[in-house]
């Protein structure tokens, strides 16, 4: 059993039919001695008397909100929350597997530019009684300062029968120098609770390799005299880290037929412009990437041939 | 993804084309080891990021676009010194710091040069004979050193009497491309940054 | 104590379906996930699938996906194996068992599939 | 496709030491803890040994299990005429938990 937060502790279970679970001794918060009465949750029941109190936990009937009274005033309470331990592996019941870029992805996390900042988001089904805490530091054994807010509700979908909820959260890295060369990870650790069920989920990376940057902005067309071909040129997005020159953007150019079975035509350039023949009612995109280092590419960027 | 390859302009400074050939044979390379060696830890998430450079150069700091020089995060280190006299500082009014970087960026490429030789003679002798450095990238460390031409010291290519351990040396290998390759993002983005100024 | 009594077993010509039971006992069954493993006669263990405490996620082996629904009825207490297009390959004493460091197995129950 | 490689058969007299084998990679044994198994004739396996080296209650400690790295054994010390039988390790990859990862088994015959 270990504390989570002031008057919430966690027990862990192995987790199995008939497993003999942990026995637990809450201690009433109080220099009281004697006619002290302890009760779980909203039931009136006494479960036992005295300045301590011993509980078989073997399953989630037996945690919750344990509480020691005298002459019918309440003294302090004792939140218990269970962690299962299934085979070895601890339950992951609270989060979906996003299985992207790999299965057993939980928590996602995305960075627009080297400055430290990135977000993160996970998928749940369950929309009540749910709770998640987030910290993050850079290393784990000599950890040095990431500051991460609180958990928002970003967005709600339907996925089939059910309704699917994403949750997300901000992090900035205290001292953080775009240029630095990472050789310690970012760790990231999410406190889940659902009702009486506690998880943890964990991520680590490097900046770098989360690095997606926003699409280029101020996308146009110019056409070219006498030709089927426009100059389309972009600016690299305000979001990315500057100089431009030191931390340099490549871009792929793509011109897409109104139907998606019509044939992409596609350019890399590193430059901030491109000719490209323009069909009609066709469009013209195009998505950023690092040049250097190959991470995420942006999302496309589009305006209309016509 | 193959890097678009830039043909240089005449007048370009002189590192950038040798960078960008750096960059892509490093990666190429760590590639090529982390599918040749599918059973050991060469992953990016497997690996001990270790850098041979560190406390020797300090081409993050040494080369830090001014925009950088602001940020209190990006000075923790910047006393390190270098000979200066390098041919791609060529017909360029370079400050003392842009010497330090180029100097500093070299003794990177000649510390990692020694390392990937020695490395190399070991994994010639492995009865195995499962991965060996490209002579590609060898020889575009040795390009891009020609190119920033400093005068330093030869350093010797380590020698070991005892029998190699083929798994350590492998994952060394891995260890060592990785942090080459985080090592030739930062040249190459130096060399851009110098490039456009 | 935990048991889990297994029935629905048999033959069953190839292409045919069937369903297989587990009657769960003597433990909160609506608590624990469940697996299903078979044995192909003088081969080795193969797992089959697994259904989460709740029902919410459910896992196949390549070799069944597409043709096994896993199910549960807990308030029934009952794990279930629904399976279709069957195939020779798919002759085998089919186990349930339970999901945990200590596990619980079914008695076993033979499908032969054959014409 | 099985994952987990065990020696097809091994034999020993009573009272001898007999080990099995179950050689895995990285991603199932080398992040996962191991079981072994204990199938006698007609029966429904039993658990000898779960969490690489745990041996539950009413398993004699005749039986023991350990890992290391991407491996792991059983050893039956002092071998009986009733511990013939196939043996099976089992493990997760991380892949693809909660799917049973199950060794090739090993048949163990007791000679004499």
């Known amino acids: 059993i270990w504390e989570l937060k002031k008057d919430v502790y966690v027990v862990e279970l192995d987790w199995y039919p008939d497993a003999p679970g942990e026995m637990v001794v809450l201690t009433c918060d109080t220099p009281e001695e004697d006619g002290i009465t302890w009760t779980l949750d909203q039931s009136s029941e006494v479960l036992g008397s005295g300045k301590t109190l011993t509980i078989q936990v073997k399953e989630f009937g037996d945690a919750g909100q344990y509480t020691c009274h005298k002459g019918g005033e309440v003294l302090s309470h004792s939140l218990l929350l269970l962690h299962k331990k299934e085979d070895g592996i601890w339950s992951t019941d609270i989060l979906k597997d996003q299985k992207e870029p790999k299965n057993k992805t939980f928590l996602r996390c995305e960075a627009k530019n080297y400055s430290g900042r990135f977000t993160c988001w996970w998928l749940t089904t369950i929309s009540t009684d749910l709770t998640f805490s987030v910290k993050s530091s850079r290393g784990s054994s000599d950890p040095q300062g990431v500051t991460c807010g609180a958990a928002t509700l970003s967005a709600e979908r339907v996925r089939g029968d059910n309704k699917e909820y994403e949750y997300s959260v901000e992090c900035q890295e205290d001292s953080a120098c775009p240029a630095a060369e990472e050789s310690l990870p970012i760790e990231v650790m999410v406190d889940a609770v659902h009702k009486l069920k506690y998880e943890n989920y964990t991520s680590s990376f490097f900046i770098r390799d989360i690095i997606k940057p926003d699409p280029p902005k101020n996308l146009q067309l110019k056409p070219l005299k006498n030709s089927r071909q426009v100059e389309v040129s972009w600016e690299y997005p305000d979001t990315w880290s500057t100089p431009h020159s030191y931390f340099s953007l490549t871009f792929c150019v793509q011109v897409q037929g109104k139907s998606k079975r019509e044939k992409k035509d596609r350019v890399f350039t590193d430059k901030t412009s491109a000719t490209v023949i323009c069909r009609k009612n066709a469009s013209i995109s195009v998505r950023a990437q690092d040049r250097y280092y190959s991470s995420s590419w942006s999302e496309w960027a589009s305006v209309p041939c016509s | 993804r193959n890097l678009p390859v830039a043909t240089p302009d005449p007048g370009m400074f002189p590192c950038l084309h040798h960078s960008q050939n750096l960059l892509r044979a490093v990666s190429n390379m760590l590639q090529k080891a982390r599918q040749t060696l599918e059973f050991y830890p060469c992953t990016s998430e497997e690996i001990d990021h270790e850098d041979i450079t560190k406390d020797k150069t300090s081409t993050v700091e040494a080369c830090l676009p001014l925009e950088l020089t602001k940020n209190e995060s990006c000075l923790n280190s910047r006393e390190t010194s270098f000979i200066t006299n390098g041919s791609c500082l060529a017909s360029r009014k370079t400050s003392f710091m842009m010497a330090l970087c180029l100097s500093s960026i070299y003794e990177d490429l000649k510390m990692y040069q020694v390392e990937f030789k020695t490395m190399n003679a070991k994994l010639l002798m492995d009865p195995k004979r499962q991965i060996f450095l490209d002579q590609n990238m060898l020889a575009v460390i040795d390009e891009l050193m020609q190119a920033l031409n400093f005068n330093s010291e030869t350093v010797p290519q380590k020698s070991s009497l005892e029998e190699p351990d083929f798994y350590k040396t492998k994952i060394k290998l891995c260890i060592l491309l990785h942090a080459f390759r985080i090592r030739a993002v930062t040249i190459d983005r130096v060399m851009s940054y110098l490039n456009a100024s | 104590q935990v048991q889990l009594v297994q029935s629905g077993g048999g033959v069953v010509q190839p292409g045919r379906s069937l369903r297989l039971s587990c009657a769960a006992s003597g433990f909160t069954f609506s608590s624990y996930g469940m697996h299903w493993v078979r044995q192909a006669p003088g081969k080795g263990l193969e797992w089959v699938a697994f259904?989460?405490?709740?029902?919410?996620?459910?896992y196949y082996a390549d070799s069944v996906k597409g043709r096994f629904t896993i199910s549960r009825d807990n308030s029934k207490n009952t794990l279930y194996l629904q399976m279709k297009s069957l195939r020779a390959e798919d002759t085998a004493v089919y186990y349930c068992?339970?999901?945990?460091?200590?596990?619980?197995w079914g008695q076993g129950t033979m499908v032969t599939v054959s014409s | 496709s099985y994952v987990l490689t065990q020696p097809p058969s091994v034999s020993g007299t009573p009272g001898q030491r007999v080990t099995i084998s179950c050689s895995g990679g990285r991603s199932n044994i080398g992040s996962n803890t191991v079981k072994w198994y204990q199938q006698l004739p007609g029966t429904a396996p039993k658990l000898l040994i779960y969490?690489?080296?745990i041996r539950p209650s009413g398993v004699p400690d005749r039986f023991s299990g350990s890992k290391s790295g991407t491996s792991a054994s059983l050893a039956i010390t002092g071998v009986q005429a009733e511990d013939e039988a196939d043996y099976y390790c089992?493990?997760?990859?991380?892949?693809?938990?909660?799917?049973?990862?199950f060794g090739t088994g090993t048949k163990v015959t007791v000679l004499g």
């Open positions: 089992q493990s997760y990859d991380r892949g693809t938990h909660p799917a049973l990862l």
């Open positions: 259904i989460r405490y709740d029902g919410s996620n459910k």
């Open positions: 969490g690489n080296d």
């Open positions: 068992k339970t999901h945990g460091s200590h596990d619980n």
